[in-house]
Amino acid sequence: TGTKIAYETKVDLVQTSEAIQESLYPTAQLCPSFEEAEATPSPVLPDIVMEAPLNSLLPSAGASVVQPSVSPLEAPPPVSYDSIKLEPENPPPYEEAMNVALKALGTKEGIKEPESFNAAVQETEAPYISIACDLIKETKLSTEPSPDFSNYSEIAKFEKSVPEHAELVEDSSPESEPVDLF
């Protein structure tokens, strides 16, 4: 049966605090647009920070996490959590392999695939990225607008630039260099 590639819709980068606190492993989308993010090396966060629960690092339970470009004085429009298309946290590895294969064929959808060849959603490789994001946002608020990831491959490219574990840099994919968000 043919299946359409999932998660190709435009990603809304405005997230609610519920989305962050519920999820142990928010993806790189929660940390949009840092200046020259790809040009800097990977953060090494102290163990005590890495092990701290996410909600202990958030300003308050009711605070919304928004794009850095939003002025703190402007209240962002209310966002329905259910309407946000979030990337999955734990896709099986072979799904990523299928996605790479499809990209190599230069096609994104409309392919009639055998049962085992399912189109993929990229691996979520940043389980602690929101912690790094929070720390960065406190020290450096960019005035640049967030990247508009309307294209699936752009998201994948952006996510691949972030190591999956700040303390496990050796795990970052071979095709991407570890980066530093600081």
């Epitope: 999932a6 989305a19 999820s23 590895p93 072979y94 189109a119 691996e123 795990d171 994919s173």
Partner: antibody
Amino acid sequence: EVKLLESGGGLVQPGGSLKLSCVVSGFDFRRNWMSWVRQAPGKGLEWIGEINPDSSKINYTPSLKDKFIISRDNAKNTLYLQVSTVRSEDTALYYCVRPVWMYAMDYWGQGTSVTVSS
Amino acid sequence: DVLLTQTPLTLSITIGQPASISCKSSQSLLHSDGKTYLNWLLQRPGQSPKRLIYLVSKLDSGVPDRFTGSGSGTDFTLKISRVEAEDLGLYYCWQGTHFPQTFGGGTKLEIK
């Protein structure tokens, strides 16, 4: 605290069908692929299949693909497994799993037992 | 499907002694992303399986460091440096590199 609570097992006659449920709490169900795994008495683990967060992708192990239907209801934080035309070899403990390959935090339910007997 | 063969089927160990379990795969488990998606699980009697190790050698949180995983390609090993009473149960390897996911047949660790 993470919980995966399976239910719906029990005694079923050969040729019958049943629907197992797994209610999830403690993590963001709506962002997770979920799987079903079964274990026949005294036997090893057998992967049944998996479903992606928005139900647009469902993979089954090829040999079992006509036997099972996996579905989910994100509003209810619930995963389902429909088992059709059951036979004695479907007698097993059925586990709901949130598998994670890249990092820690792999979760298994306690299992629900299905016995096929006339 | 990828066949995972575990040996031995049963391992009878005295408490305090080391133990080693092998898992051989019918094809390489090295993924195109450079990682190897092999897990080790422990199922204690009457309990659900619990993952001990992921990505061949990384310990899950709360797992004692007497457990170590090693290997690459098609050959993998789980070692317990000093077996304790709580380690008894069934050990499974589990691969996620290739579709469909598959489990090894299991190794029963019993205490002498």
